[in-house]
Amino acid sequence: LEVSESPGSVQVARGQTAVLPCAFSTSAALLNLNVIWMVIPLSNANQPEQVILYQGGQMFDGALRFHGRVGFTGTMPATNVSIFINNTQLSDTGTYQCLVNNLPDRGGRNIGVTGLTVLVPPSAPQCQIQGSQDLGSDVILLCSSEEGIPRPTYLWEKLDNTLKLPPTATQDQVQGTVTIRNISALSSGLYQCVASNAIGTSTCLLDLQVISPQPRSV
């Protein structure tokens, strides 16, 4: 019995269906086929879980969190024992193993391994201002999404006709910050932060109001 090489990893957007491949070749009839799918969750590598089981011509549910979401892609028994997981969740990310036995066929490699990564688009970012908005001050524009896998990058732009940040601004696209030194009236206006990763984008708007000192009455 020989389980075929798997592609290594599967990526899927949260909520979509993942197909985890596993196929094998055997010299015996599929009368005593036994397939166990296990997962080593990324969030808890010490706690392997059963995903689905095929034994004695019957399918059995694995861990409760997979109930109603998992099945074999084809009619069993078969040499293609790939599974699907519907409505994927972040917690489904992990290393999946298919263990195949088909007595009396012994020997060979009977385990296939596939990694699953559930991707999450950036959640609506929060746009905030840190620091005094008084003329001549330094301010930091902050942009941060609570969710996003892979980790989002952040692009700030000023919504004026140049779409460029003020000349005194420095941007950190990883941290999502823009530092504007020595703010002036020209720093005022509407800014857009776009949080993006491989599967999506999300935006917030922020307006910076530079406060000019009131002329003192004599």
């Epitope: 779409l163 984008t201 935006t203 708007l205």
Partner: antibody, heavy 121, light 110 residues
Framework: EVQLLESGPGLVKPSQTLSLTCTVS??????????WSWIRQHPGKGLEWIGY???????YYNPSLKSRVTISVDTSKNQFSLKLSSVTAADTAVYYC?????????????WGQGTLVTVSS | QPGLTQPPSMSYGLGQTATLTCTGN????????AAWLQQHQGHPPKLLSY???NGPSGISERLSASRSGNTASLTISGLQPEDEADYYC???????????FGGGTKLTVL
């Protein structure tokens, strides 16, 4: 209560420049935090955002109209203005001035009554 | 060509509940939510709600706005004759970097 009022010629010849002014009362353009916009509505059709100006003079125009639009502000008169060059019959519309702010998530909470501009020779 | 899609017209009976829809994409409604405007014939638009179900003061409690995915909805319960108007949705489009509007829905109260 903030009020906006558009003024300007109702008839413009093709290839000329359309010029409109919006006078703001009941609030100061200079108070900051407001984005003073122009929006138009073609006869019997939907709305189209043209652009905005901030009290500091910073402008931002709809990319689809950018090459023909100029918006300016006169804080001493509490007015902002629109110029749209090289007009054609397709620019015939009711032109509104409007205000957007952070408090309404940058949507338009105050509108002028609108002025119909016809482009015709 | 409007950036958001609305049904051109809808008719409901007096006292019924109307649900108006507005469909965009992930760069506008899916990202930012939507605002709703009401326009009576010969009048400027009036802001009813923004960012899904926030609204200016003085707006009728018969109105309720929501969003599901890339579609925004405005529900008007207990329809009155004064609800007969054109309704527009609007959203900031982060890709176009512009405010976009729907083509409008003409609501008729029978």
């Amino acid at each position: 209560e903030v009020q906006l009022l558009e003024s300007g010629p109702g008839l413009v010849k093709p290839s000329q420049t359309l010029s409109l002014t919006c006078t703001v009362s009941g609030g100061s353009i200079s108070s900051g935090g407001y984005y003073w916009s122009w929006i138009r509505q073609h006869p019997g059709k939907g709305l189209e955002w043209i652009g905005y100006i901030y009290y500091s003079g910073s402008t931002y125009y709809n990319p689809s109209l950018k090459s023909r639009v100029t918006i300016s502000v006169d804080t001493s008169k509490n007015q902002f203005s629109l110029k749209l060059s090289s007009v054609t019959a397709a620019d015939t519309a009711v032109y509104y001035c409007a205000r957007a702010s952070r408090s309404t998530d940058y949507y338009f909470d105050y509108w002028g009554q609108g002025t119909l501009v016809t482009v015709s020779s | 060509q409007p950036g958001l899609t609305q049904p051109p017209s809808m008719s409901y009976g007096l006292g019924q509940t109307a649900t108006l829809t507005c469909t965009g994409n992930r760069n506008n409604i899916g990202d930012q939510g939507a605002a709703w405007l009401q326009q009576h014939q010969g009048h400027p638009p009036k802001l009813l709600s923004y960012r899904n179900n926030n609204g200016p003061s003085g707006i009728s409690e018969r109105l309720s706005a929501s969003r599901s995915g890339n579609t925004a909805s405005l529900t008007i319960s207990g329809l009155q004759p004064e609800d007969e108007a054109d309704y527009y949705c609007s959203a900031w489009d982060s890709s176009l970097r512009a405010w976009v509007f729907g083509g409008g829905t003409k609501l008729t109260v029978l």
